[in-house]
Interface confidence: low
């Protein structure tokens, strides 16, 4: 059951001091902003008991798990039904408190009645201020039954409800005819969905035998323990002044739980705290009585004494509810009342026992809800106890329920039931949501609805490029925070999946469904401009460009150069794949062509603005290469070149160009024009002695033609260093074109 308690402070001398507090012991209760836990709600329910309107009540939240209602100005504000709602999802639970006016004509002998299906319920309204009129009984605000005023028995009006069924549950009231509804006696009837001691669909399962006034929940078989008791079967008393499923809450004020009414989830209802009784929970239990409403009797044996909060306190050598068990009888020690495991895990469960004779391994066994008995695989024997360890086979959902550890020796036997909750690891029902995207990152909300059980302890986000077979990248994130996936590729689809885990071994759920998230690719905004270009041949063009300087990283992957040949209607595109490049050599162009040239930055598949265009005219293609080039040294500074004219000339040659280079030298070559195109020999002068030279030549008509073969020749020795090579008869106007 959900750990939810509604406390009413019944010190009623001053309504302004009256308050209601709802306390949740659930993990993450009331966090509201957290997607895993809705907030606690505490309100007056005016649907059945309507009171005159007054100033609004004040709601104050104290931390994440407590909410208090104050601001009652007059006694009539208090009369009626109040409810607290807490817990998440399927565990969302409503706890109800019914408040009666102490000055009413009729008062309930007992406000909350919890009965089993098929039982007879008897509601008893005690006459407080007599009126000689009929009494009207109502159920959930609707007329139900009338009793004549003289039908009172022993100053009480009784309503008998035979063979009650769950739909009979609700708020009942007894009111004198024509009296104010605020003077009514209000009751709450809770009808369990099963007969006594049974629970579950079809009521086929047996309740664990709740102790100390605990009530077996008809849906899950758990004991809803009275305030001040804990354990699977409510077998353990809390310290005085404590309440909550684990005794974790403390009653406020110096007088402990005096004057407080405690309301718990159905089918428990409401009662005083342990050790107190009376309509305002201000009377201590009479000797020999203990527990909530002092309903329990101690009946202590063997010298035990009765404590009104916890029951029998046994002398040494004895234990048990009534101190009826000798310590010679074996006893299960410190068994947790509730254990939680994840589905399909194989946990180890320990069970410790003491006694005389001492329990050994074979004397301790573990029984599952289906009756299967497990024997321990190992035992640790210590001076004061034996701890048996059980290896549990792979858990299935049907293993949820009450398990039992049993010890048997010749001194007797003991058993302890405990609840095992098998939890289903959470599986996302939806894919994560994309919040924002950039070219290299995605911001994702990992919060999704899920099947299975919470709470969610970790969220893993798995991602990899779409259609990739590479390993998934994984990031572990906080369930409540958005996640940024970084260092991604621009304009790339990523498959993204969520994996949820709950606490404990084997708490990782299956991966959720994938979703496709695509990184962005911002459009490049910078416009380059062409710095310059020069022709490196009839079909080669070197181009250079610049970009404006802007702060921040450059948004771009490279440049696209476009050459438009308007005559032929053709476009040539050249991709420069480095965004740092500022120059490119374009080859394989058509000689003699007029091109329009521009450059633009690109990012992924997006193009930025093009530069202002440039117009470039490539020279036409030249004649074929001269044939049979030959070199012959004439002296230490002269070499003669001879050749034959090219064949199939498209027109008259305007000149020849000779290229001279020192063999193995690192310097640039020299170009010398031969302006008499009819000649087939020339002498290159001004060379260095004993030096090896390389020569080649080409003809020019409108444009330069193809190079001839390269020839080698060395000058003769013993000469002086020359100033540089010149052509035979034109040394004064040699044409050097570098």
């Amino acid at each position: 059951a959900v750990d939810l308690t509604l406390l009413a402070n019944l010190r009623l001398t001053d309504p302004q001091r009256f308050f209601l507090t709802c306390v949740s012991g659930e993990a993450g209760a009331g966090r509201g902003s957290d997607a895993w836990g809705p907030p606690l709600l505490l309100e007056k329910d005016d649907r059945i008991v309507r009171t005159p309107p007054g100033p609004p009540l004040r709601l104050a939240r104290n931390g994440s798990h407590q909410v208090t209602l104050r601001g009652f100005s007059k006694p009539s504000d208090l009369v009626g039904v109040f409810s607290c709602v807490g817990g998440a999802g399927a565990r969302r639970t409503r706890v109800i408190y019914v408040h009666n006016s102490p000055g009413a004509h009729l008062l309930p002998d007992k406000v909350t009645h919890t009965v089993n299906k098929g039982d007879t319920a008897v509601l008893s309204a005690r006459v407080h201020k007599e009126k000689q009129t009929d009494v009207i009984w109502k159920s959930n605000g609707s007329y139900f039954y009338t009793l004549d005023w003289h039908e009172a028995q022993d100053g009480r009006f009784l309503l008998q409800l035979p063979n009650v069924q769950p739909p009979s549950s609700g708020i009942y009231s007894a009111t004198y005819l024509e009296a104010s509804p605020l003077g009514s006696a209000f009751f709450r009837l809770i009808v369990r969905g099963c007969g006594a001691g049974r629970w579950g669909p079809g009521c086929t399962k047996e309740c664990p035998g709740c102790l100390h006034g605990g009530v077996c929940h008809d849906h899950d078989g758990e004991c809803v323990c009275p305030p001040g008791f804990t354990g699977t079967r409510c077998e353990q008393a809390c310290r005085e002044g404590r309440f909550g499923q684990s005794c974790q809450e403390q009653c406020p004020g110096i007088s402990g739980c005096r004057g407080l009414t405690f309301c718990l989830p159905d089918p428990y209802g409401c009662s005083c705290g342990s050790g107190w009784r009376g309509s305002q929970c201000q009377e201590a239990c009479a000797p020999g009585h203990f527990g909530a409403d002092c309903r329990l009797q101690c009946q202590c044996q063997n010298g035990g004494t009765c404590d009104r909060f916890s029951g029998c306190v046994c002398p040494s050598g004895w234990h048990g509810v009534h101190c009826e068990k000798s310590d010679r009888i074996p006893q299960i020690l410190n068994m947790a009342s509730e254990l939680e495991f994840n589905l399909e895990t194989m946990p180890r469960i320990n069970c410790a026992a003491a006694g005389n004779p001492f329990p050994v391994r074979g004397s301790i066994e573990l029984r599952k809800p289906d009756g299967t008995v497990l024997l321990s695989t190992k035992a640790i024997v210590e001076p004061e106890k034996t701890t048996a360890e059980f290896e549990v086979p792979r858990l299935v959902l049907a293993d949820s329920g009450f398990w039992e550890c049993r010890v048997s020796t010749s001194g007797g036997q003991d058993s302890r039931r405990f609840k095992v909750n098998v939890k289903v690891p959470p599986v996302p029902l939806a894919a994560p949501r994309l919040l924002t995207k950039q070219s290299r990152q995605l911001v994702v909300s990992p919060l999704v609805s899920f099947s299975g059980d919470g709470p969610i302890s970790t969220v893993r986000l798995h991602y990899r490029p779409q259609d990739s077979t590479m390993d998934w990248s994984t990031i572990v994130v906080d369930p409540s925070e958005n996640v940024t996936l970084m260092n991604l590729r621009p304009k790339t689809g990523y498959s993204v999946r969520v994996q949820l885990s709950r606490p404990g071994e084997g708490g990782e759920g299956a991966w959720g469904p994938p979703t496709l998230m695509t990184t962005d690719c911002p459009e490049p905004l910078l416009q380059p401009w062409l710095e310059g270009w020069h022709v490196e041949g009839t079909d080669r063009l070197r181009v250079s460009w610049s970009l404006p300087l802007v702060p921040g990283p450059l948004v771009g992957d490279g440049f696209l150069l476009r050459l438009w040949d308007g005559t032929r209607g053709q476009e040539r595109r050249e991709n420069v794949s480095s965004p740092q490049a500022r120059t490119a050599l374009l080859t394989g162009l058509t000689p003699g062509t007029h091109y329009q040239l521009d450059v633009q930055l690109y990012h992924c598949t997006l193009l930025g603005p093009a530069s202002p265009p440039a117009h470039v005219l490539l020279p036409p293609s030249g004649p074929p290469a001269p044939r049979h080039l030959h070199a012959q040294a004439l002296s230490d500074s002269e070499i003669q070149l001879t050749w034959k004219h090219p064949e199939a000339l498209p027109g008259p040659i305007s000149k020849y160009v000779v290229e001279v280079q020192v063999a193995g030298g690192a310097g640039d070559p020299l170009w010398i024009d031969v302006d008499r195109p009819e000649e087939t020999s020339t002498i290159i002068r001004g060379l260095n002695a004993s030096t090896r030279y390389l020569f080649r030549m080409r003809a020019s008509i409108q444009g330069l033609g193809d190079w001839s073969n390269t020839v080698e020749e060395s000058t003769l020795g013993n000469g002086l260093q020359a100033e540089g090579p010149v052509q035979e008869s034109r040394a004064a106007e040699e044409g050097l074109d570098q």
């Epitope: 289903v424 599986v427 029902l429 894919a431 299975g452 299956a510 991966w511 469904p513």
Partner: antibody, heavy 119, light 107 residues
Framework: EVQLLESGGGLVQPGGSLRLSCAAS????????MQWVRQAPGKGLEWVSV????????NYADSVKGRFTISRDNSKNTLYLQMNSLRAEDTATYYC????????????WGQGTMVTVSS | DIQMTQSPSSLSASVGDRVTITCWAS??????LAWYQQKPGKPPKLLIF???TLQGGVPSRFSGSGSGTEFTLTISGLQPEDFATYYC?????????FGDGTKVEIR
């Protein structure tokens, strides 16, 4: 191609049993919530049962609760429906269907298999 | 359990007509509703989920609207291939009940 293919239908006598199978292909079966839906001849659609990815969580329509069992074998990419104590009113075409990840809507359906309960 | 009621149970229409089918839920289901199309001898086909979101590959002439307890499927220009039976289904927790269907026939 994403596909679901049911099999195992046929004629059975009242009180008898039948096991339907649904073979999944073209998607990661172990990540999806799966359902059985049926349609009596000439009638509308009736949801029968659901099973969550790990196989640990199931739910049934009241009309089949206690008689039908849904299960799955993720290693075989197969969904099952074990039908016991069959009645004449169970006669229908049985479809298996996949649930969209972000809603409970059924986005992929099999072609269906006919179950006839008659003496 | 949530009951789903569809209206009309059948209707006759011509190609090009605008057709509206209404579905009511017995309690508030916010926008947890789907629409399916089924042709004889074939399995149903998902058209719309979350009351108004078109399933991928479904023509844009199909649209859904509504929230709470009343929902509408509209076909804004009936095509020959649209003559079929249409079902609504609530998605607001189990059991996921369907409406009884609306048969759209050729006039």
């Amino acid at each position: 191609e994403v596909q679901l293919l049911e099999s195992g239908g046929g004629l059975v006598q009242p009180g008898g049993s039948l096991r339907l199978s649904c073979a999944a292909s073209g998607f990661t079966f172990s990540n999806y919530v799966m359902q059985w839906v049926r349609q009596a001849p000439g009638k509308g659609l009736e949801w029968v049962s659901v099973i969550y990815p790990s196989g640990g969580m199931t739910n049934y329509a009241d009309s089949v609760k206690g008689r039908f069992t849904i299960s799955r074998d993720n290693s075989k990419n197969t969904l099952y429906l074990q039908m016991n104590s069959l009645r004449a009113e169970d006669t229908a075409t049985y479809y298996c269907a996949r649930i969209r990840g972000d809603t409970r809507a059924f986005d992929i359906w099999g072609q269906g298999t006919m179950v006839t309960v008659s003496s | 359990d949530i009951q789903m009621t569809q209206s009309p149970s059948s209707l006759s229409a011509s190609v090009g007509d605008r057709v509206t089918i209404t579905c009511w839920a017995s309690q508030d289901i916010r926008t947890s509703l789907a629409w399916y199309q089924q042709k004889p001898g074939k399995p149903p086909k998902l058209l719309i989920f979350a009351a108004s979101t078109l399933q991928g590959g479904v023509p844009s002439r199909f649209s859904g609207s509504g929230s709470g307890t009343e929902f509408t499927l509209t076909i804004s220009g009936l095509q020959p291939e649209d003559f079929a039976t249409y079902y609504c289904q609530h998605l607001n927790g189990y059991p996921l009940t369907f409406g009884d269907g609306t048969k759209v026939e050729i006039r």
